[in-house]
């Protein structure tokens, strides 16, 4: 059996291997092997055949026994050494370096902008529904329901600051107590961690890269879920956050201050405002129970308007309703009074794409969601590739050492805390934990940052986003100052409590172990990553919310047995792991259960079966797209999948042996040797390791 079970029968036809790859593969790309075009058996390699969904070399790559997939990869510089280059080569190299750096900044800018647009898209698609979750006050007094509302709303609007500002408004207008708002804030904290998990999905092309990226992203999720798991019952029992924040507010007499500097927004807003502008007040009005807001569009049409206060004659039901007794009369039919009416006069329309389209919010939302995800994915691929080509040799060594090395003994323990401060500082600068953690995800994926270092950076990011909220609260008007400050402080102390729980003692750094476990599963069964995302961020919160609607007895009746079962499984797992001897023989493993209950293999088979049905149709489309791209790019070496052909047709084409050229930008280790020999002198760009792997989903 292979050391990586996911590689067993990696193809629908196990007997059909990539030519010239039948033996155990080394992880060094074929480019680096100056060997003649023969395989291990000495047979000449004619060409490489790409097979559907499993066409990358990475899938048949077997890790030598004893290697840890979590070890950071060596990013070797395969290019010509600096000393060996002539003046022209050096100049070209400098220009290339500067060009790559500019491109990197450009893609990073587009990446951040697409995250902003993605948030707007989510608000257009689910913002009104999210607002309605908040308007059900009776449910929100239940802390568990409050928690899931916080999760759902933040997932739907892709912005914890939006959900926080709704909560602040509701507390300020006495629609919600601070006690009821705390679980919602906890939920918002969980909801905000979905963004970098979505970003991690974009790196599914390479199993090991995906393993690291997904673990790096979900370490945030696990920290938040585990913190809530401990702190929500604690808060429900003791109200420590409410008491502590009250104490802080009474001890320090807070004055209105300046808001946090919006450094990133200043750069991204000019671009994102050309794409879409939203009227965030609409969601807030819906949450506050304003039924009229339901029919309003979230898309901002007018950006400049003036407010005129004019005296207007308005009808009232009777003279008792007159605003001023001296200004009240009847015309014999209606009773009138004079009122100061504030009229908004629109002057200038906004300058975004959708301003003149009378499309419904949902349609615009879906368009933007699609476009922003495509741009996000594209930018991520390009960032990963550019970083891969830049971070090599000396540069990689220096960066990796700087980021992942601890302080010398006895101060090694301080490194993590410094990372927390760095994470908090960076988040404070960019004003968004989502942006910071999402930008960090590809770096974890390519192995520049280790999971162990990403964890404190993420925790710091959580702190950073709350300090931003505190500053925003200090800048809020007098009537909402106290409530917004108390909620921001609750958020802050919740994260501090979480850090105290899951960071100081290495043994308690459970989120790292859980994230690595999930990373391993997701690398083996990539569909599980999508399942995890849907299950934990949508299905579970929606189920809990539905049960909350039914009332406490139903929620407890269904929830308690499930929790007890989970605890039982957990205890049994611990005993199996720690001291199996005390267990009866049958309980020492999970084999007493049907396979589908303790293994993902049967589920994987079902999903593989389902995806294969779509694959034939999908591959035809992919091949056409691939060919068009090759033609447009004028690529040198491009092979397009033949997965939708019949066996006979494939054989025919094999005989013809017409390779299609593809650009080096999309290097594929499984490509034919004739492509790989070209451009040996170039600095090797990190392989995308077969785009076709993304079809695993």
């Amino acid at each position: 059996m292979a050391p990586w079970p996911e590689l067993e029968n990696a193809q629908p036809n196990p007997g059909k291997f990539i030519e010239g790859a039948s033996g155990p593969q080394s992880s060094i790309p074929a480019k680096d092997k100056e060997a003649s075009k023969t395989n291990d058996n000495g047979t000449p390699v004619a060409k490489t055949e790409l097979l559907p969904s499993y066409s990358a070399l990475v899938l048949i790559e077997e890790h030598p026994e004893g290697t840890d997939p979590w070890d950071l990869p060596e990013l070797q510089d395969t290019g010509i050494k600096w000393s060996e280059r002539d003046t022209k080569g050096k100049t070209l190299c400098i220009f290339q370096g500067v060009g790559k750096f500019i491109l990197l900044l450009g893609f990073l800018y587009l990446f951040v902008c697409s995250l902003d647009v993605l948030s707007s898209a989510f608000q257009l698609v689910g913002g009104k529904v999210a607002g309605q979750f908040f308007s059900n006050n009776s449910i929100m007094s239940n802390p568990v329901a409050g928690l899931v509302i916080g999760v759902l709303v933040t997932v739907m609007v892709q912005s914890s600051s939006t959900s926080s500002s709704i909560i602040v408004s509701m507390v300020a207008s006495s629609l919600l107590t601070v006690r009821a708002a705390i679980p919602i804030i906890m939920g918002a904290n969980i909801g905000t961690s979905i963004t970098n998990t979505i970003v991690a999905l974009m790196q599914a092309g390479d199993r090991n890269e995906f393993r690291r990226a997904f673990a790096g992203a979900t370490v945030h999720d696990f920290f938040n879920w585990l913190s809530v798991f401990v702190l929500l019952p604690l808060e429900a029992a003791t109200h420590y956050l409410e008491i502590l924040t009250n104490l802080v507010l009474e001890t320090f007499k807070f004055q209105n201050g300046e808001d946090a500097p919006d450094i990133l927004k200043v750069i991204t807003d000019p671009f994102t405002k050309l794409i879409i502008q939203l009227d965030k007040k609409v969601i807030q009005q819906i949450a506050m129970g304003d039924s009229a807001a339901q029919n309003k569009s979230l898309i901002k049409i007018w950006c400049k308007s003036i407010t005129n206060v004019t005296e207007m004659n308005v009808t009232v039901p009777s003279t008792d309703n007159c605003t001023s007794p001296s200004y009240c009369w009847t015309d014999g039919i209606q009773t009138w009074t004079i009122q100061n009416v504030t009229q908004k006069e629109n002057i200038a329309k906004c300058q975004h794409i959708f301003v003149n389209f009378s499309l419904p919010d949902l349609a615009v939302g879906i368009i933007l969601l699609t476009v922003s995800l495509v741009v996000l994915c594209g930018c991520l691929i390009m960032i990963v590739k550019l970083l891969g080509s830049v971070l090599r040799g000396q540069v990689a060594t220096v960066i990796k050492k700087t980021l992942n090395t601890d302080f010398p003994f006895p101060f090694a323990w301080l490194t993590g805390y410094l990372a927390i401060l760095v994470g908090a500082g960076m988040t404070f600068i960019v004003q968004s934990s989502s942006v910071f953690t999402s930008a960090m995800t590809p770096l974890i994926g390519i192995g520049v940052i280790s999971i162990e270092r990403a964890y404190p950076l993420t925790l710091g990011s959580n702190i950073g986003t709350t300090t931003t909220a505190i500053l925003a609260a200090l800048a809020s008007p007098g009537n909402t100052l106290r409530s917004s400050l108390q909620i921001a402080l609750c958020h802050f102390f919740f994260n501090i409590s979480g850090i105290l729980l899951w960071y100081p003692i290495p043994f308690t750094r459970l989120p790292i172990r859980l994230a690595k476990g999930l990373g391993n599963i997701s690398a083996k069964y990539r569909w599980f990553a999508v399942f995890y995302l849907i299950f934990f961020f949508f299905v579970t919160p929606l189920t809990v919310f539905g049960l909350s609607l039914a009332g406490w007895p139903v929620l407890v009746g269904v929830g308690v047995p499930i929790i007890l079962l989970l605890l039982l499984v957990l205890c049994l797992r611990m005993l199996q792991f720690r001291c199996p001897r005390i267990l009866p023989l049958k309980l020492r493993d999970w084999n007493f259960l049907p396979l589908w209950m303790h293994s993902l293999k049967p589920w994987d088979n079902v999903i593989s079966l389902a995806t294969t049905c779509f694959q034939r149709r999908c591959c035809c489309c992919c091949r056409v797209c691939c060919r068009v791209c090759c033609m447009v790019c004028g690529c040198k070496c491009c092979r397009c999948s033949k997965c939708c052909r019949d066996q006979g047709e494939e054989e025919e084409e094999k005989e013809q042996d017409i390779p299609v050229k593809a650009s080096g930008a999309f290097d594929n280790a499984a490509m034919s040797k004739e492509c790989q020999d070209e451009g040996k002198g170039q600095v090797e760009v990190l392989s995308m390791k077969a785009l076709s792997n993304t079809t695993v989903f």
Epitope: T319, S326, Y327, C328, W329, T330, D331, G332, I333, W336
Partner: antibody, heavy 120, light 107 residues
Framework: QVQLVQSGAEVKKPGSSVKVSCKTS????????IHWVRQAPGQGLEWIGG????????NYKQNFRGRVTLTADKSTSTAYMELSSLRSEDTAVYYC?????????????WGQGTTVTVSS | DIQVTQSPSSLSTSVGDRVTITCTAS??????VAWYQQKPGKSPKLLIY???TRHTGVPERFTGSGSGTDFTLTISSVQPEDVATYFC?????????FGVGTKVEIK
């Protein structure tokens, strides 16, 4: 100029009905309320009711409800008042008057009046 | 219904004299009071609305004042064409109600 021209004098028998018209010109009919006021010989003015021609909303004085019907024809800018179950005490001069809708300027223009005599 | 009482019911004056007609409402009507002039054999004409606002084309000798329950119409210098019956009307609440009228004559 603003004009409210009423129909001619009517002589009616008790128990019958009378329909008085008020044709307007010189202003936007739908922007005003048309009121009907009567004046018995040697007496003061008594308000009967009013109609908003724009939406046909009406209001009547309590003691006329059920006996009076106010209507308006926007196409001809004409208002009508029909009074049924006539009694001798309904003998009076009936006036139509306009009142600017949503304004407190009172009845700023009146018709010339229609004399309705009820006798057996 | 709001009752409107007018006094005097009639008065005789000389050209150039100052004449004051009073109107009392049975309850507070704010300033929702209008004054009308009706010459013999003619239809009424609006003089004053909102207690003190002169209607367009009304001579300046006619002034209205008051608020709450007590209102007055003053003709600062009576002219021969001012011979008429003057009515006050409240329009604070429905139904609209009129005073019985004050008949002004010239000696």
């Amino acid at each position: 100029q603003v004009q409210l021209v009423q129909s001619g004098a009517e002589v009616k028998k008790p128990g019958s009905s009378v329909k008085v018209s008020c044709k307007t010109s010189g202003f936007f009919f739908t922007e005003y309320i048309i009121h009907w006021v009567r004046q018995a010989p040697g007496q003061g003015l008594e308000w009967i009711g009013g109609i908003i021609p724009n939406n046909d909303v009406t209001n009547y004085k309590q003691n006329f409800r059920g006996r009076v019907t106010l209507t308006a024809d926007k196409s001809t800018s004409t208002a009508y008042m029909e009074l049924s179950s006539l009694r001798s005490e309904d003998t009076a001069v009936y006036y139509c008057a306009r009142w600017r809708n949503a304004y407190y300027s009172a009845m700023d223009s009146w018709g010339q009046g229609t004399t309705v005599t009820v006798s057996s | 219904d709001i009752q409107v009482t007018q006094s005097p019911s009639s008065l005789s004056t000389s050209v150039g004299d100052r004449v004051t007609i009073t109107c009392t409402a049975s309850q507070d009507v704010g300033t929702a009071v209008a004054w009308y002039q009706q010459k013999p054999g003619k239809s009424p004409k609006l003089l004053i609305y909102w207690a003190s606002t002169r209607h367009t084309g009304v001579p300046e000798r006619f002034t209205g004042s008051g608020s709450g329950t007590d209102f007055t119409l003053t003709i600062s210098s009576v002219q021969p064409e001012d011979v008429a019956t003057y009515f006050c009307q409240q329009y604070r609440t429905s139904p609209l109600t009129f005073g019985v009228g004050t008949k002004v004559e010239i000696k």
